[in-house]
């Protein structure tokens, strides 16, 4: 028998520095977690103690904090090189700055293979990107070889900016021939490493013949055997065992997100490459693990540029940006409009001639808007200003909901109106009218939404049975502020870009902004 240790991360999302327990900015260092300096300590400790170790990343290193905003992926290559990752799969967010924003900072600089079997380049891009990412890689580990085959969510064109010269094929269809190729090369230990979410990970384990282990990402799935060490609730045991169609037991793993845990899976293979046993658990990277001085010093060095960036002007406002709770928790506020407009603008994807865009709607809890921005400071808007407005380090995500769920959400928005509570919704691509004289749960008297399957966008009444795409904060997607109906009834959820980054990019693009209060939210006569 031969034993392999698989260390894995996924959805790190630019958390190079240690974070608080909820993966936001570290405040009390003695209680902080994760970060590449701490990860390095643990990885080196395991590498010293065990002979056959692979360190793998299942995608979405890009996007999530000011680190990515400023360094644009150079930080990912630098620190992943320092940690000597053995392989990485491409995630959807690796395309957030377009194909060039992937090629130059990461693909050309990485000292490890970057993989995806289901992304096919065409046209002029094919020769430019050739060899920079691979469908698979055979890695020597001790006296054996291990094949790693990559995959990426086929939804990437709707979630990011891969352009028109990359085709995202069905994962299972694309993976099978690559695994077959590895088998003909006498590689009998094969790991599928990818970024399509836990459901697809399980399908790959079930359907792709020859895959021995699946290491996934995208869905931020936390698996654990025994008593979990922090706040995350396990979605199943680690590893999650799938019985393949050809009768094999295939371990499937994922390690939550944000570099909070290091996935740790031990696999025992027989001489024919069959998995005999698999066991392990994610390791919580808490403060009991010291940060490595060499990596931490490098982090401190790179950090300086971030501090300078936060005070630089992104653009100007010529109007007061009203982000006060007195406004945003009671009525339409222009800060809410600005943020929602930025959210929609960030999700412009012309992937189908029938649609002007795949999504037109935004909702945003007023309680998530934490500060106004005064225009009387020469109109200057900085990252620092935006961090006061959106201090929670969240993301603006894409969900699919039925019209009936949206109606419930808008009823919840005003079910206890007047108490300055955070659930009052700011909107984009939606016209809502409330009648507060009616009883809670029956106060939405008009709800019109902007069409997407149209050449001239216009507002049509919401249809209860229709499925709509909506951009909203991850806080709402997870049921925050009492929006349990969104969490319970959503049909699809894909994590998006860092909230501040979305707004800062929009302001930089527009250069001068002047958002107005324009009648998106109305109260019927006599009730307000």
């Amino acid at each position: 028998a031969w034993e392999l240790t698989i260390l894995h991360t996924n959805d790190v999302h630019s958390r190079l520095e240690q974070t608080s327990e909820d993966s936001s900015k570290c405040v009390n260092a003695s209680r902080c977690m994760g970060g590449v300096a701490r990860l390095f300590t643990k990885v080196q400790q395991i590498r010293r103690a065990e002979p056959n170790v692979l360190l793998l990343d299942a995608g979405d290193q890009y996007q999530g904090t000011i680190w990515f905003t400023v360094y644009k992926g150079a930080e990912v290559a630098h620190f992943m090189n320092a940690l000597r990752y053995d392989a990485m799969a491409l995630g959807n967010h690796e395309f957030d700055n377009g194909v060039e924003g992937l090629i130059e900072p990461l693909l050309k600089e990485a000292k490890f293979p970057i993989l995806s079997a289901n992304i096919k380049a065409k046209g002029p891009l094919a020769s430019q990107i050739s060899g920079l990412y691979l469908p698979y890689k055979v890695l020597p580990v001790g006296d054996e070889v291990v094949g790693i085959v990559g995959y990426t969510s086929k939804e990437t064109p709707f979630l990011s900016n891969p352009g028109t010269n990359l085709v995202f094929e069905d994962e299972i269809t694309a993976l099978q021939p690559e695994v077959d190729k590895l088998k003909t090369l006498n590689v009998n230990k094969i790991i599928a490493l990818g970024h399509s979410g836990f459901e697809m990970d399980k399908l790959i384990a079930q359907k792709v013949r020859g895959v021995d282990v699946v290491v996934g990402g995208h869905s931020n799935t936390f698996l654990y055997t025994g008593n979990p060490p922090s706040k995350e609730v396990p979605a199943g045991k680690y590893p999650f065992i799938v019985t393949s169609d050809d009768g094999r037991k295939v371990p499937v793993v994922q390690a939550y997100a944000f570099g909070k845990y290091l996935g740790y899976l031990k696999i025992e293979f027989d001489e024919r490459g069959n998995v005999i046993s698999s066991h392990g658990n994610p390791i919580l990277l808490n403060s009991s693990i010291p940060e490595d001085p060499s990596i931490k010093a490098d982090i401190n060095k790179w950090r300086i540029k971030l501090d300078n960036y936060s005070t630089q002007e992104l653009g100007k406002t010529i109007v007061y940006l009203d982000g006060s709770s007195q406004s945003c928790r009671f009525r339409e506020c222009n800060m809410g409009n600005l943020i929602c407009d930025a959210m929609i603008n960030n999700n412009l994807r012309h992937t189908d001639e029938m649609f002007w865009n795949h999504v037109s709607m935004c909702i945003l809890n007023g309680g998530g808007i934490r500060s106004p921005i005064d225009e009387r400071n020469n109109g200057t808007i900085t990252w620092e200003n935006l961090a006061a407005v959106l201090p929670f380090g969240g993301t603006f995500d894409l969900v699919q909901l039925k019209g009936s769920t949206l109606k419930k959400a808008f009823e919840h928005s005003v079910h206890r109106y007047g108490q300055s509570t955070g659930e009052f919704l700011q909107v984009g691509g939606i016209h809502v009218v409330y009648d507060l004289s009616r009883k809670p749960g029956d106060r939405v008297v008009k709800l019109d939404v902007l069409c997407t399957k149209c050449r001239v966008p216009s507002y049509d009444p919401l249809k209860m049975d229709e499925v709509y795409k909506v951009i909203l904060p991850n806080f709402l997607a997870n049921g925050g502020d009492g929006f349990q109906m969104i969490k319970d009834e959503l049909l699809r959820h894909d994590s998006g870009d860092q909230d501040i980054n979305v707004v800062s990019t929009y302001i930089s693009k527009m250069k001068v902004i002047y958002p107005a209060v324009e009648g998106r939210i109305k109260f019927s006569t006599g009730s307000h």
């Epitope: 390095f40 080196q44 590498r47 002979p51 170790v53 090189n81 320092a82 000597r84 053995d86 000292k111 580990v141 001085p293 060499s294 990596i295 931490k296 010093a297 490098d298 401190n300 060095k301």
Partner: antibody, heavy 120, light 111 residues
């Protein structure tokens, strides 16, 4: 178990060429830098240079630049230090030592040393 | 290049007693919040072994009696209770920048 095994002692004449080796095992060879250091009889230690076995990128101390060449062979997990023309002053013990691939990292594992004697 | 000066050149200490070795750098070896001073132990006929890195962090498997301190240019290696197996030459080394440089060594013997 991490091991760096160096080639045996060498006795050479001035002007001759020499290539000594350091075979790594117990870890992923391409995951760390390999450094070469010199220790002259009853003297301290001097860092000569390093190689990144992943892409063969090298970095030399100015003192040893153009005097020695550091190479690595990925498939055999072996690093090499070579001279094209030895001098009597090259007589010393030469060590290979591993370090994490970041500038400020220490030398965490060392080979047993190769004694080179250059004498006419 | 950063010049490292160790003192004393040799040191005789009774078993169980404290041994203290000093190392001074010609310029600061501090780098973004850390001091990159490392200490190695070399026994006769053996290669050096890492004891302490980044001024105060113990190397893997190093006994607790070895500790390091200091910042900037002045550093100390302390053996809290000298054991017979600690007889060796001890070297300091800076890894702030290349070329990495070593002190001349301190020979520790039993009194």
């Amino acid at each position: 178990e991490v091991q760096l095994v160096q080639s045996g002692a060498e006795v050479k004449k001035p002007g001759e060429s020499l290539k000594i080796s350091c075979k790594a095992s117990g870890y992923t060879f391409t995951g760390y830098w390999m450094n070469w250091l010199r220790q002259m009889p009853d003297k301290g230690l001097e860092w000569m240079g390093r190689i990144d076995p992943y892409d063969s990128e090298t970095h030399y101390s100015q003192k040893f630049k153009d005097k020695v060449t550091i190479t690595a062979h990925k498939s055999s997990s072996t690093a090499y230090l070579q001279w094209s023309s030895l001098k009597a002053s090259d007589s010393a013990i030469y060590y290979c030592a591993r370090s994490s691939p970041i500038t400020t990292a220490p030398f965490d594992y060392w080979g047993q040393g190769t004694t080179v004697t250059v004498s006419s | 290049d950063i010049v490292m000066t160790q003192s004393p050149a040799s040191l005789a200490v009774s078993l169980g007693e404290r041994a203290t070795i000093s190392c001074r750098a010609s310029e600061s070896v501090d780098y973004y919040g850390f001091s990159f001073m490392n200490w190695y132990q070399q026994k006769p006929g053996q290669p050096p072994k890492l004891l302490i890195y980044a001024a105060s962090t113990q190397g893997s498997g190093v006994p607790d009696r070895f500790s390091g301190s200091g910042s900037g240019t002045d550093f100390t290696l302390t053996i809290s209770s000298l054991q017979a197996e600690d007889v060796a030459v001890y070297y300091c080394q800076q890894s702030k920048e290349v070329p990495y440089t070593f002190g001349g060594g301190t020979k520790v013997e039993i009194k």
